[in-house]
């Protein structure tokens, strides 16, 4: 596991404890909460980040209408169970034995049940729609410049391969970033779109997960891009299973 050798820290995850007790005395960083060793050369999985957080304190000019199956994370924070690779376990339960199934980004995709609830597989979230509203500016941003800046951000800051940023839509003041990544497209070593979206969400909220880096300073042609509202929609490879009662509520 790589980490900055000189002072043994994890550049990509401040929610770690690092010590020179890895193989050969190399720096090894463990995520708070889980104690799992993390690879500091890339993003840490959202599951481990949530666990750490709980332990510490189409048409270019048209906005996308989220699918009827799109999920929004309304449940907020919880202390998740992560598998040995740091991914969300398909079934999550709380202290009172209430259980539910989640997708690969940890968002609930079924009604809540008891310990008998079965979640056969971890369903992959293959499409993420990040919906932003920016603060008023003198004029609209140039769409091409905005597109280029956001793609650069995801490539350089979050190490997400450019092919997974499907589109950037803009109708002032709303910006939409579409991330797409099918199971078959994701190769070993590729950053997961769910992890990139989570790092971006925390950056936008001024809660950067990066060690020692300044907060996110988004600029388009020198003009600050200040976000005042964020909504993230998650679309799974298999539609979620909620009862009709919830769908009509």
């Amino acid at each position: 596991h790589t980490a900055a050798q000189d002072n043994c820290t994890c550049p990509t995850n401040k929610m770690t404890v690092c010590s020179p007790d890895g193989p050969g005395g190399r720096c090894q960083c463990r995520a708070l909460g889980s104690g799992m060793a993390v690879d500091c050369s890339t993003l840490t999985s959202k599951c481990l980040l949530l666990k750490a957080r709980m332990s510490a304190p189409k048409n270019a000019r048209t906005l996308v209408r989220p699918s009827e199956h799109a999920l929004v994370d309304n449940d907020g924070l919880y202390d998740p169970d992560c598998d040995p690779e740091g991914r969300f376990k398909a079934r999550q339960c709380n202290q009172t034995s209430v259980c539910w199934c989640v997708n690969s980004v940890g968002v609930r995709r079924t009604d809540k049940g008891d310990l008998s609830l079965r979640c056969d597989e971890l369903v992959r979230t293959h499409h993420i729609l990040i919906d932003l509203r920016h603060r008023p500016t003198a004029g609209a941003f140039n769409h091409s410049d905005l597109d280029a800046e956001l793609r650069r951000l995801f490539r350089e800051r979050y190490r997400l391969h450019p092919k997974f940023v499907a589109a950037v839509h803009y109708e002032q003041p709303t910006i939409q970033i579409e991330l797409r990544q099918n199971t078959s497209q994701k190769a070993a070593g590729d950053v997961d779109i769910g992890d990139a979206a989570y790092y971006f969400e925390r950056d936008i909220k001024g809660e950067s997960l990066f060690q020692g880096r300044g907060g996110l300073d988004l600029r388009v042609r020198g003009e600050p891009l200040q976000v005042e509202r964020t909504l993230i929609y998650y679309l799974d490879e298999i539609p979620p299973k909620f009862s009709m009662k919830r769908l009509t509520a």
């Epitope: 043994c8 404890v17 010590s19 020179p20 007790d21 890895g22 193989p23 050969g24 005395g25 708070l32 909460g33 889980s34 104690g35 799992m36 060793a37 598998d83 040995p84 690779e85």
Partner: antibody, heavy 117, light 107 residues
């Protein structure tokens, strides 16, 4: 030479607390985790938790979470493990251990804590 | 938590024989396993780390193998001082856990 020297044996009454110390020498105290492991008579090893002396970050085994407190004093390179609300089943040898790589490479000599009325 | 199951509980062998001890994890832990030897009245002694990496000062007759969920400690030829209890321990995630131990006794 790396050494972990623990405090002496203790006899306590049920409901009392015990505080065991572990003094480290021969390495950079703040750079390595210190773990606490206990072993009841004739039983196996049980991990209680650990502390990272550099910043006092602690992590406890859920089983002991409400009763155990681990602290450190960097000026004396000493780590402490306090266990409260003692019961007879807490009778055991308590070891401190310095964590290296994937294993607990260095161990204290052990401290026998006997809980008896 | 990750449960480690060691087998057999007791292994009766003669000096010079080969000892094979098994440790099975309840879930994939890669190679995050260590092996210890413990003699009566003594603290455990680290023998192997990262499933197969030997520790300096430990005799070459001790070797480890395995990854994922199945791990093995092998003592190629038992010496009289090797009769003891052996524990595996995982450090994949907290809480760190130990196996129940395998006692290697003289036949």
């Amino acid at each position: 030479e790396v050494q972990l020297v623990q405090s002496g044996a203790e006899v306590k009454k049920p409901g009392a607390s015990v505080k065991v110390s572990c003094k480290a020498s021969g390495y950079t105290f703040t750079s390595y985790w210190i773990n606490w492991v206990r072993q009841a008579p004739g039983q196996g090893l049980e991990w209680m938790g650990n502390i990272y002396p550099s910043n006092s970050y602690t992590n406890y085994n859920q089983k002991f979470k409400d009763r155990v407190t681990m602290t450190r004093d960097t000026s004396t390179s000493t780590v402490y493990m306090e266990l409260s609300s003692l019961r007879s089943e807490d009778t055991a040898v308590y070891y401190c251990s310095s964590y290296r790589s994937d294993g607990f490479a260095y161990w204290g000599q052990g401290t026998l804590v006997t809980v008896s009325s | 938590e990750i449960v480690l199951t060691q087998s057999p509980a007791t292994l009766s062998l003669s000096p010079g024989e080969r000892a094979t001890l098994s440790c099975r994890a309840s879930q994939n832990i890669g190679t995050s396993i260590a092996w210890y030897q413990q003699k009566p009245g003594q603290a455990p002694r680290l023998l192997i780390e990262f499933a197969s990496e030997s520790i300096s000062g430990i005799p070459a007759r001790f070797s480890g193998s395995g990854s994922g969920t199945d791990f093995t400690l092998t003592i190629s030829s038992l010496e009289p001082e090797d009769f003891a209890v052996y524990y595996c321990q995982q450090s994949n995630s907290w809480p760190f856990t130990f196996g129940g131990g395998t006692k290697v006794e003289i036949k």
